[in-house]
Protein backbone atom coordinates (compact mmCIF):
# COMPACT_ATOMS: atom_id res chain seq x y z
CA UNK A 1 0.00 0.00 0.00
CA UNK A 2 0.75 3.25 -0.76
CA UNK A 3 2.36 5.80 1.77
CA UNK A 4 -0.60 8.44 3.27
CA UNK A 5 0.42 12.26 2.10
CA UNK A 6 1.95 14.28 4.67
CA UNK A 7 0.61 18.11 4.57
CA UNK A 8 1.65 20.20 2.28
CA UNK A 9 0.38 18.07 -0.28
CA UNK A 10 -0.76 18.83 -3.90
CA UNK A 11 -4.85 18.61 -4.56
CA UNK A 12 -6.23 18.69 -8.07
CA UNK A 13 -9.77 18.27 -6.78
CA UNK A 14 -9.79 21.12 -3.82
CA UNK A 15 -10.43 18.57 -1.08
CA UNK A 16 -8.30 17.41 1.71
CA UNK A 17 -8.36 13.95 3.08
CA UNK A 18 -8.71 14.74 6.91
CA UNK A 19 -11.23 17.98 6.76
CA UNK A 20 -10.98 18.68 10.20
CA UNK A 21 -7.44 18.95 10.70
CA UNK A 22 -6.36 19.81 7.27
CA UNK A 23 -7.46 22.62 5.10
CA UNK A 24 -7.33 23.44 1.15
CA UNK A 25 -4.96 26.79 0.42
CA UNK A 26 -5.88 27.95 -2.89
CA UNK A 27 -2.91 29.94 -3.60
CA UNK A 28 -1.06 27.03 -4.17
CA UNK A 29 -3.97 24.34 -4.48
CA UNK A 30 -2.28 22.25 -1.58
CA UNK A 31 -4.06 21.01 2.19
CA UNK A 32 -2.19 21.87 5.06
CA UNK A 33 -2.47 21.39 8.64
CA UNK A 34 -4.97 23.37 10.51
CA UNK A 35 -3.79 24.37 14.20
CA UNK A 36 -5.08 22.42 16.91
CA UNK A 37 -7.33 24.30 19.34
CA UNK A 38 -5.56 26.47 21.99
CA UNK A 39 -3.15 27.49 19.20
CA UNK A 40 -3.07 30.18 15.72
CA UNK A 41 -1.00 29.94 12.75
CA UNK A 42 1.58 31.96 13.25
CA UNK A 43 3.39 31.08 9.43
CA UNK A 44 1.20 29.98 6.61
CA UNK A 45 2.33 27.15 4.90
CA UNK A 46 3.57 27.23 1.29
CA UNK A 47 4.58 24.17 -1.18
CA UNK A 48 7.68 23.22 0.61
CA UNK A 49 6.64 23.67 4.67
CA UNK A 50 3.45 23.12 6.39
CA UNK A 51 1.53 25.45 8.96
CA UNK A 52 3.59 26.77 11.62
CA UNK A 53 1.20 27.32 14.64
CA UNK A 54 1.66 29.34 18.46
CA UNK A 55 -0.04 29.17 21.57
CA UNK A 56 -2.81 31.53 22.26
CA UNK A 57 -1.78 34.14 24.38
CA UNK A 58 -3.54 34.56 28.24
CA UNK A 59 -7.02 35.59 27.66
CA UNK A 60 -7.40 34.33 24.24
CA UNK A 61 -8.34 31.07 22.33
CA UNK A 62 -9.26 29.13 19.66
CA UNK A 63 -12.04 26.03 19.91
CA UNK A 64 -11.31 24.48 16.83
CA UNK A 65 -8.93 22.83 14.88
CA UNK A 66 -7.95 26.44 12.93
CA UNK A 67 -5.95 28.34 10.16
CA UNK A 68 -6.91 31.05 12.03
CA UNK A 69 -3.93 34.06 12.52
CA UNK A 70 -5.05 35.39 15.52
CA UNK A 71 -6.60 33.60 18.82
CA UNK A 72 -10.22 35.24 19.92
CA UNK A 73 -10.68 37.68 22.89
CA UNK A 74 -11.77 35.82 26.00
CA UNK A 75 -15.08 37.84 27.42
CA UNK A 76 -16.65 37.69 30.97
CA UNK A 77 -19.88 36.73 31.74
CA UNK A 78 -22.13 39.71 31.56
CA UNK A 79 -23.59 39.89 34.81
CA UNK A 80 -25.87 42.89 33.34
CA UNK A 81 -27.44 40.18 30.89
CA UNK A 82 -28.06 38.12 34.49
CA UNK A 83 -25.35 35.75 33.10
CA UNK A 84 -22.52 33.98 35.44
CA UNK A 85 -19.87 31.68 35.22
CA UNK A 86 -19.27 28.33 35.25
CA UNK A 87 -16.14 27.63 33.88
CA UNK A 88 -13.22 30.14 33.21
CA UNK A 89 -11.72 30.79 29.73
CA UNK A 90 -8.80 28.63 28.59
CA UNK A 91 -6.92 28.43 25.34
CA UNK A 92 -8.64 25.74 24.29
CA UNK A 93 -12.55 27.02 24.99
CA UNK A 94 -14.32 30.31 25.41
CA UNK A 95 -15.49 31.15 29.25
CA UNK A 96 -18.76 29.28 29.64
CA UNK A 97 -21.71 31.31 31.06
CA UNK A 98 -25.06 30.46 32.51
CA UNK A 99 -28.41 31.97 33.73
CA UNK A 100 -27.80 33.40 37.66
CA UNK A 101 -30.53 31.14 39.59
CA UNK A 102 -33.67 32.52 39.69
CA UNK A 103 -33.56 33.46 35.69
CA UNK A 104 -34.00 31.76 32.16
CA UNK A 105 -32.17 32.32 28.81
CA UNK A 106 -34.59 34.70 26.97
CA UNK A 107 -32.22 35.38 24.18
CA UNK A 108 -30.24 32.80 22.22
CA UNK A 109 -27.56 33.37 19.31
CA UNK A 110 -25.86 30.01 19.42
CA UNK A 111 -25.41 30.47 23.16
CA UNK A 112 -27.17 32.30 25.79
CA UNK A 113 -26.83 36.27 25.46
CA UNK A 114 -29.79 37.78 27.78
CA UNK A 115 -31.28 35.64 30.62
CA UNK A 116 -34.87 37.55 32.50
CA UNK A 117 -36.13 36.42 35.92
CA UNK A 118 -38.76 33.92 36.09
CA UNK A 119 -41.91 33.98 36.98
CA UNK A 120 -43.75 33.20 40.20
CA UNK A 121 -45.55 30.17 40.48
CA UNK A 122 -48.92 31.12 42.46
CA UNK A 123 -49.94 29.25 45.82
CA UNK A 124 -50.92 25.74 45.06
CA UNK A 125 -48.19 25.26 42.21
CA UNK A 126 -44.72 24.31 41.47
CA UNK A 127 -42.16 25.05 38.95
CA UNK A 128 -42.02 21.94 36.23
CA UNK A 129 -38.67 20.29 37.01
CA UNK A 130 -37.33 21.07 33.67
CA UNK A 131 -33.98 18.89 32.70
CA UNK A 132 -31.58 22.08 31.90
CA UNK A 133 -31.27 24.73 34.24
CA UNK A 134 -32.12 27.97 32.65
CA UNK A 135 -33.30 26.62 29.47
CA UNK A 136 -36.80 28.20 29.29
CA UNK A 137 -39.58 30.10 31.67
CA UNK A 138 -41.11 28.32 34.76
CA UNK A 139 -44.06 25.98 33.45
CA UNK A 140 -46.42 26.03 36.80
CA UNK A 141 -48.20 22.67 37.30
CA UNK A 142 -50.72 22.26 40.50
CA UNK A 143 -49.52 20.45 43.39
CA UNK A 144 -49.88 16.63 44.17
CA UNK A 145 -52.01 14.60 46.06
CA UNK A 146 -50.93 15.13 49.79
CA UNK A 147 -48.18 17.79 48.91
CA UNK A 148 -48.93 22.25 49.13
CA UNK A 149 -47.08 25.27 48.33
CA UNK A 150 -48.13 28.68 49.71
CA UNK A 151 -46.79 30.92 48.56
CA UNK A 152 -45.60 32.67 45.03
CA UNK A 153 -42.49 32.10 44.26
CA UNK A 154 -40.36 31.06 41.22
CA UNK A 155 -38.58 28.38 42.80
CA UNK A 156 -40.56 26.71 45.84
CA UNK A 157 -41.15 23.37 45.89
CA UNK A 158 -44.71 21.08 46.87
CA UNK A 159 -44.08 19.98 50.23
CA UNK A 160 -45.50 16.65 51.62
CA UNK A 161 -49.00 17.87 54.16
CA UNK A 162 -47.69 17.32 57.91
CA UNK A 163 -48.62 14.29 59.66
CA UNK A 164 -50.06 15.61 63.30
CA UNK A 165 -50.36 12.20 64.79
CA UNK A 166 -47.05 12.13 64.74
CA UNK A 167 -46.76 15.09 67.04
CA UNK A 168 -49.18 14.11 69.15
CA UNK A 169 -51.69 15.87 67.91
CA UNK A 170 -55.00 15.61 65.42
CA UNK A 171 -56.10 16.83 62.59
CA UNK A 172 -58.18 20.04 62.82
CA UNK A 173 -58.36 20.85 59.36
CA UNK A 174 -56.89 18.52 56.24
CA UNK A 175 -54.35 20.01 53.89
CA UNK A 176 -55.07 21.62 50.71
CA UNK A 177 -52.62 22.10 47.32
CA UNK A 178 -52.17 25.58 49.34
CA UNK A 179 -52.14 25.03 52.66
CA UNK A 180 -50.35 22.16 55.23
CA UNK A 181 -52.67 19.91 57.32
CA UNK A 182 -53.94 22.26 60.75
CA UNK A 183 -52.75 20.34 64.11
CA UNK A 184 -54.58 21.06 67.30
CA UNK A 185 -54.15 19.52 70.17
CA UNK A 186 -56.74 15.64 71.21
CA UNK A 187 -58.15 17.71 74.08
CA UNK A 188 -59.61 20.56 72.46
CA UNK A 189 -62.96 20.23 70.70
CA UNK A 190 -63.45 19.76 67.38
CA UNK A 191 -65.54 22.63 64.98
CA UNK A 192 -68.85 21.24 64.57
CA UNK A 193 -68.80 20.32 60.67
CA UNK A 194 -65.08 18.65 61.12
CA UNK A 195 -67.05 15.92 63.58
CA UNK A 196 -67.20 12.59 62.51
CA UNK A 197 -64.62 9.73 61.80
CA UNK A 198 -62.12 8.83 59.14
CA UNK A 199 -61.52 5.60 57.66
CA UNK A 200 -59.33 4.27 55.30
CA UNK B 1 -25.96 1.76 55.03
CA UNK B 2 -29.98 1.83 55.23
CA UNK B 3 -30.54 -1.82 55.49
CA UNK B 4 -33.33 -3.93 56.50
CA UNK B 5 -32.79 -8.05 57.39
CA UNK B 6 -36.12 -10.05 57.91
CA UNK B 7 -36.69 -13.51 59.39
CA UNK B 8 -36.69 -16.75 58.16
CA UNK B 9 -38.74 -18.64 56.06
CA UNK B 10 -42.02 -20.21 57.40
CA UNK B 11 -44.26 -23.09 56.97
CA UNK B 12 -47.50 -22.80 58.56
CA UNK B 13 -50.63 -25.09 58.75
CA UNK B 14 -54.20 -23.63 57.72
CA UNK B 15 -55.78 -21.44 60.87
CA UNK B 16 -52.32 -20.45 61.91
CA UNK B 17 -50.59 -17.13 62.21
CA UNK B 18 -47.58 -16.07 61.69
CA UNK B 19 -45.16 -13.04 62.75
CA UNK B 20 -42.43 -11.94 60.83
CA UNK B 21 -39.81 -9.58 61.84
CA UNK B 22 -37.63 -7.02 59.96
CA UNK B 23 -34.38 -5.19 61.57
CA UNK B 24 -33.66 -1.65 60.74
CA UNK B 25 -30.02 -0.63 60.37
CA UNK B 26 -28.30 2.86 58.97
CA UNK B 27 -31.14 5.40 59.70
CA UNK B 28 -32.98 6.64 62.60
CA UNK B 29 -35.86 3.90 62.90
CA UNK B 30 -38.62 6.07 64.27
CA UNK B 31 -38.53 8.95 61.54
CA UNK B 32 -39.90 6.39 58.72
CA UNK B 33 -42.72 4.16 58.29
CA UNK B 34 -42.67 0.52 57.99
CA UNK B 35 -44.41 -0.82 55.30
CA UNK B 36 -45.60 -4.55 54.56
CA UNK B 37 -46.02 -5.83 51.27
CA UNK B 38 -46.62 -9.29 49.99
CA UNK B 39 -45.89 -11.63 46.71
CA UNK B 40 -47.35 -14.77 45.64
CA UNK B 41 -45.32 -16.84 43.41
CA UNK B 42 -45.47 -15.84 39.87
CA UNK B 43 -47.90 -13.09 40.92
CA UNK B 44 -47.20 -9.23 41.12
CA UNK B 45 -46.77 -6.91 44.56
CA UNK B 46 -49.57 -6.62 46.89
CA UNK B 47 -49.65 -3.83 49.68
CA UNK B 48 -50.50 -5.14 53.22
CA UNK B 49 -50.34 -1.80 54.95
CA UNK B 50 -48.04 0.70 56.59
CA UNK B 51 -47.12 1.26 60.42
CA UNK B 52 -45.85 4.65 62.44
CA UNK B 53 -42.91 3.22 64.51
CA UNK B 54 -42.75 6.66 66.22
CA UNK B 55 -46.29 6.64 67.31
CA UNK B 56 -47.23 2.40 66.63
CA UNK B 57 -50.28 3.67 64.45
CA UNK B 58 -50.66 1.67 61.41
CA UNK B 59 -52.98 1.82 58.29
CA UNK B 60 -54.24 -1.38 56.49
CA UNK B 61 -56.46 -2.03 53.67
CA UNK B 62 -60.10 -3.38 53.77
CA UNK B 63 -58.53 -6.62 52.03
CA UNK B 64 -56.07 -7.60 55.50
CA UNK B 65 -58.33 -5.54 58.44
CA UNK B 66 -58.79 -7.86 61.31
CA UNK B 67 -56.48 -10.33 59.80
CA UNK B 68 -52.98 -8.63 59.88
CA UNK B 69 -51.66 -6.62 62.94
CA UNK B 70 -48.33 -4.44 62.51
CA UNK B 71 -46.25 -3.51 65.77
CA UNK B 72 -42.58 -2.66 66.95
CA UNK B 73 -39.89 -2.55 69.47
CA UNK B 74 -38.25 0.78 69.28
CA UNK B 75 -35.87 -0.34 71.01
CA UNK B 76 -33.99 -3.27 68.99
CA UNK B 77 -35.02 -1.48 65.82
CA UNK B 78 -37.47 -3.89 64.83
CA UNK B 79 -40.98 -4.02 62.86
CA UNK B 80 -43.26 -6.85 62.73
CA UNK B 81 -45.96 -8.05 61.02
CA UNK B 82 -48.55 -10.79 62.10
CA UNK B 83 -50.92 -12.29 60.12
CA UNK B 84 -53.97 -14.52 61.36
CA UNK B 85 -55.93 -17.50 60.25
CA UNK B 86 -53.80 -18.20 57.34
CA UNK B 87 -54.98 -20.24 54.22
CA UNK B 88 -52.96 -21.42 51.23
CA UNK B 89 -53.57 -18.67 49.53
CA UNK B 90 -51.49 -16.51 52.29
CA UNK B 91 -48.45 -18.44 50.84
CA UNK B 92 -46.26 -15.86 49.58
CA UNK B 93 -42.87 -14.31 49.99
CA UNK B 94 -43.44 -10.81 52.83
CA UNK B 95 -41.06 -7.93 52.15
CA UNK B 96 -40.70 -5.11 54.54
CA UNK B 97 -40.30 -1.39 53.07
CA UNK B 98 -38.89 1.38 54.10
CA UNK B 99 -41.61 4.53 53.59
CA UNK B 100 -42.20 7.64 54.24
CA UNK B 101 -41.19 10.14 56.89
CA UNK B 102 -43.37 9.78 59.82
CA UNK B 103 -43.25 13.47 60.24
CA UNK B 104 -45.15 13.85 56.43
CA UNK B 105 -48.59 11.78 55.21
CA UNK B 106 -48.41 8.48 54.56
CA UNK B 107 -49.02 9.31 50.74
CA UNK B 108 -46.01 11.28 50.67
CA UNK B 109 -43.34 8.53 50.63
CA UNK B 110 -41.94 5.86 48.57
CA UNK B 111 -40.54 2.03 48.97
CA UNK B 112 -36.33 2.22 49.81
CA UNK B 113 -35.14 0.22 50.58
CA UNK B 114 -36.67 -3.58 50.64
CA UNK B 115 -35.85 -5.93 53.16
CA UNK B 116 -34.68 -9.47 51.30
CA UNK B 117 -38.25 -11.22 51.91
CA UNK B 118 -39.28 -14.02 54.35
CA UNK B 119 -41.44 -16.86 52.67
CA UNK B 120 -43.94 -18.12 54.61
CA UNK B 121 -45.67 -21.23 53.41
CA UNK B 122 -49.23 -22.60 54.57
CA UNK B 123 -49.55 -26.09 53.99
CA UNK B 124 -51.59 -28.52 56.05
CA UNK C 1 -61.43 0.71 45.13
CA UNK C 2 -58.39 2.05 43.01
CA UNK C 3 -56.83 0.39 40.05
CA UNK C 4 -53.65 0.03 38.49
CA UNK C 5 -53.01 -0.96 34.76
CA UNK C 6 -49.91 -2.17 33.39
CA UNK C 7 -49.52 -4.35 30.22
CA UNK C 8 -48.35 -7.90 31.26
CA UNK C 9 -45.47 -7.67 28.81
CA UNK C 10 -42.80 -5.03 26.57
CA UNK C 11 -40.50 -6.84 24.29
CA UNK C 12 -37.11 -4.40 23.17
CA UNK C 13 -34.16 -4.88 21.49
CA UNK C 14 -31.07 -3.93 22.67
CA UNK C 15 -30.07 -0.22 22.27
CA UNK C 16 -33.55 0.81 21.52
CA UNK C 17 -35.88 2.18 24.09
CA UNK C 18 -38.91 0.76 26.29
CA UNK C 19 -41.90 2.22 27.57
CA UNK C 20 -44.37 0.96 30.14
CA UNK C 21 -47.47 2.51 30.93
CA UNK C 22 -49.34 2.29 34.38
CA UNK C 23 -52.76 3.92 33.67
CA UNK C 24 -55.23 4.82 36.68
CA UNK C 25 -57.68 7.63 37.16
CA UNK C 26 -56.83 11.23 37.17
CA UNK C 27 -53.42 9.55 37.74
CA UNK C 28 -51.64 12.44 36.95
CA UNK C 29 -52.73 13.93 40.43
CA UNK C 30 -50.76 11.51 42.38
CA UNK C 31 -46.86 10.73 41.98
CA UNK C 32 -45.88 7.39 40.66
CA UNK C 33 -43.42 5.42 41.74
CA UNK C 34 -41.33 2.60 39.67
CA UNK C 35 -39.78 -0.36 41.10
CA UNK C 36 -37.82 -3.30 39.13
CA UNK C 37 -37.65 -6.63 40.44
CA UNK C 38 -35.62 -9.50 39.19
CA UNK C 39 -36.15 -13.22 39.60
CA UNK C 40 -35.07 -14.16 42.85
CA UNK C 41 -34.49 -10.36 44.09
CA UNK C 42 -36.28 -8.25 46.44
CA UNK C 43 -38.10 -4.86 44.16
CA UNK C 44 -35.66 -1.57 43.65
CA UNK C 45 -36.84 1.65 43.45
CA UNK C 46 -36.00 3.29 40.27
CA UNK C 47 -38.32 6.32 39.66
CA UNK C 48 -40.18 8.03 42.45
CA UNK C 49 -42.55 11.23 41.99
CA UNK C 50 -42.92 10.66 38.85
CA UNK C 51 -39.54 11.55 37.03
CA UNK C 52 -36.81 11.84 39.71
CA UNK C 53 -34.37 9.02 39.98
CA UNK C 54 -32.73 7.56 43.03
CA UNK C 55 -28.48 7.95 43.14
CA UNK C 56 -27.20 4.81 41.63
CA UNK C 57 -30.39 4.37 38.67
CA UNK C 58 -28.55 4.81 35.42
CA UNK C 59 -29.40 7.88 33.44
CA UNK C 60 -30.89 5.85 30.76
CA UNK C 61 -34.41 5.04 32.99
CA UNK C 62 -36.86 8.22 33.09
CA UNK C 63 -40.32 8.70 34.22
CA UNK C 64 -43.72 11.12 33.12
CA UNK C 65 -47.14 11.52 34.73
CA UNK C 66 -50.08 13.03 33.10
CA UNK C 67 -53.51 12.57 32.83
CA UNK C 68 -54.83 9.09 33.58
CA UNK C 69 -51.26 7.41 32.34
CA UNK C 70 -47.95 7.43 33.88
CA UNK C 71 -44.59 5.82 31.77
CA UNK C 72 -41.38 4.70 32.74
CA UNK C 73 -38.99 4.90 29.51
CA UNK C 74 -35.09 3.04 29.42
CA UNK C 75 -33.44 4.55 26.44
CA UNK C 76 -30.56 2.06 25.36
CA UNK C 77 -32.30 -0.73 26.83
CA UNK C 78 -29.43 -3.61 27.93
CA UNK C 79 -29.76 -7.22 28.36
CA UNK C 80 -29.23 -6.71 32.55
CA UNK C 81 -32.38 -4.37 32.33
CA UNK C 82 -34.72 -7.42 31.85
CA UNK C 83 -36.83 -7.85 34.73
CA UNK C 84 -40.47 -7.04 36.37
CA UNK C 85 -41.67 -3.64 36.64
CA UNK C 86 -44.27 -2.51 38.68
CA UNK C 87 -46.09 1.19 38.77
CA UNK C 88 -47.49 2.21 42.25
CA UNK C 89 -49.20 5.41 43.52
CA UNK C 90 -51.37 6.20 47.00
CA UNK C 91 -54.78 6.46 46.61
CA UNK C 92 -55.05 8.93 49.94
CA UNK C 93 -53.21 6.24 52.58
CA UNK C 94 -54.08 3.14 51.08
CA UNK C 95 -50.89 2.13 48.47
CA UNK C 96 -51.77 0.81 44.99
CA UNK C 97 -49.67 -1.33 42.93
CA UNK C 98 -49.71 -1.75 38.94
CA UNK C 99 -50.31 -5.74 37.92
CA UNK C 100 -46.65 -5.54 36.89
CA UNK C 101 -45.14 -5.47 33.71
CA UNK C 102 -42.15 -8.06 32.00
CA UNK C 103 -39.50 -6.37 30.17
CA UNK C 104 -37.96 -8.99 27.74
CA UNK C 105 -34.70 -7.55 26.23
CA UNK C 106 -34.53 -10.14 22.69
Known amino acids: SQPQAVPPYASENQTCRDQEKEYYEPQHRICCSRCPPGTYVSAKCSRIRDTVCATCAENSYNEHWNYLTICQLCRPCDPVMGLEEIAPCTSKRKTQCRCQPGMFCAAWALECTHCELLSDCPPGTEAELKDEVGKGNNHCVPCKAGHFQNTSSPSARCQPHTRCENQGLVEAAPGTAQSDTTCKNPLEPLPPEMSGTMLM | QVQLVQSGAEVKKPGASVKVSCKASGYTFTSYDINWVRQATGQGLEWMGW????????GYPQKFQGRVTMTRNTSISTAYMELSSLRSEDTAVYYCARGGLTMKVVGAGWFDPWGQGTLVTVSS | SYELTQPPSVSVSPGQTASITCSGDKLGDKYAFWYQQKPGQSPLLVIY???KRPSGIPERFSGSNSGNTATLTISGTQAMDEADYYC?????????FGGGTKLTVL
Open chain 3, 88 to 96: QAWDISTGV
Open chain 2, 51 to 58: MNPNTGNT
Open chain 3, 49 to 51: QDK
